[in-house]
């Protein structure tokens, strides 16, 4: 079934942008001016998820790339990765659970909770130029709040 999708960028609550760091990793750093063109454009899709009062299930692909953020166990720890998919089959309404994030919107800030690993969130470090990762704490040192900006084509 077709899905509703949009193109956007994400910045963490410290205004760090997300950029590619090698072929399968994202990192967060402050960008200005023309460097803003480096930031990753996401294709965010509305997908099927668990019933909930106010969590909205989404998948986060990289625009015009066959890469999706996914959550898997590595060395017994929930881990965020970029995973290649067959572009003929994605996005789709019934995404595999590892690709699904519960978008939680509070006061214009977004959190992205892993559907596969509840209470684990897409996170960035306070430090500059560090990988985007899956974190198991909210409200601590690591940043789990993001803002979204539509991308005009």
């Amino acid at each position: 079934a077709p899905v509703r999708s949009l193109n956007c960028t994400l910045r963490d609550s410290q205004q760090k942008s997300l950029v590619m760091s090698g072929p399968y990793e994202l990192k967060a750093l402050h960008l200005q001016g023309q460097d803003m063109e480096q930031q990753v454009v996401f294709s965010m899709s509305f997908v099927q998820g668990e019933e909930s009062n106010d969590k909205i299930p989404v998948a986060l692909g990289l625009k015009e790339k066959n890469l999706y953020l996914s959550c898997v166990l590595k060395d017994d720890k929930p881990t965020l990765q970029l995973e290649s998919v067959d572009p003929k089959n994605y996005p789709k309404k019934k995404m595999e659970k590892r690709f699904v994030f519960n978008k939680i919107e509070i006061n214009n800030k977004l959190e992205f909770e892993s559907a596969q690993f509840p209470n684990w969130y897409i996170s960035t470090s306070q430090a500059e130029n560090m990988p985007v990762f899956l974190g198991g704490t909210k409200g601590g040192q690591d940043i789990t709040d993001f803002t979204m900006q539509f991308v005009s084509s």
């Epitope: 949009l6 193109n7 019933e51 919107e105 803002t147 900006q149």
Partner: antibody, heavy 119, light 108 residues
Framework: EVQLVESGGGLVQPGGSLRLSCTAS????????MAWVRQAPGKGLEWVGI???????YYASWAKGRFTISRDTSKNTVYLQMNSLRAEDTAVYYC?????????????WGQGTLVTVSS | EIVMTQSPSTLSASVGDRVIITCQAS??????LSWYQQKPGKAPKLLIY???TLASGVPSRFSGSGSGAEFTLTISSLQPDDFATYYC??????????FGQGTKLTVL
């Protein structure tokens, strides 16, 4: 004050075109999803379509091809371009803001603008 | 395309009555359902989203329930301000966002 104001409605002949505008105040359209919903006189609500970023628009099946939603973020305005209008397009047209991205429901509505298609 | 069917189309009741309006989806939409109230000449007002969550500022006499394809809107004790038309809306089943045909609530 957070509000939406529609304009551009009026009388148009069958086969004609009309562009409706919806201007937002009190918030930025740069990260808001905006929809159009219409209501024919004495009838129910009918979803027309929705716009996210400028490349991501979705329409009711009956609206595809004749109706186009666009946005101008610099003017904080969303548009509904209606072509090949028919008598059955006569309705009050509302713009509305999606409560959250992909929530599908609408918490903020404009006052509506009446479009009458008649010769 | 998912079709939303409300019943009854019209309903007459008195102040203080308990009122139930039902909405049926042509296929499962989980809990992706909203309810709106509309008064003549006015824009709709969101009452309930995700089948059972009360929108901000909506009185607690309104409640919603259901999941899958069957949903209900209940007004526990009808007030004079509640006479209006009520619409259900599928908010998440596929690309289309469909409304029910409406239920007009009138004074008995």
């Amino acid at each position: 004050e957070v509000q939406l104001v529609e304009s551009g409605g009026g009388l148009v002949q069958p086969g004609g075109s009309l562009r409706l505008s919806c201007t937002a105040s009190g918030f930025s359209l740069s990260d808001a999803a905006m929809a159009w919903v219409r209501q024919a006189p004495g009838k129910g609500l009918e979803w027309v379509g929705i716009i996210y970023d400028s490349a991501s628009t979705y329409y009711a099946s009956w609206a595809k091809g004749r109706f186009t939603i666009s946005r101008d973020t610099s003017k904080n305005t969303v548009y509904l371009q209606m072509n090949s209008l028919r008598a059955e397009d006569t309705a009050v047209y509302y713009c509305a803001r999606e409560r959250q991205i992909f929530s599908g429901d609408f918490v903020l509505w404009g006052q509506g603008t009446l479009v009458t298609v008649s010769s | 395309e998912i079709v939303m069917t409300q019943s009854p189309s019209t309903l007459s009741a008195s102040v203080g009555d308990r009122v139930i309006i039902t909405c049926q989806a042509s296929q499962s939409i989980d809990n992706w359902l909203s309810w709106y109230q509309q008064k003549p000449g006015k824009a709709p007002k969101l009452l309930i989203y995700r089948a059972s969550t009360l929108a901000s500022g909506v009185p607690s006499r309104f409640s919603g329930s259901g999941s899958g394809a069957e949903f209900t809107l209940t007004i526990s004790s009808l007030q004079p301000d509640d006479f209006a038309t009520y619409y259900c809306q599928n908010t998440g089943g596929g690309i289309n966002i469909a409304f029910g045909q409406g239920t007009k609530l009138t004074v008995l």
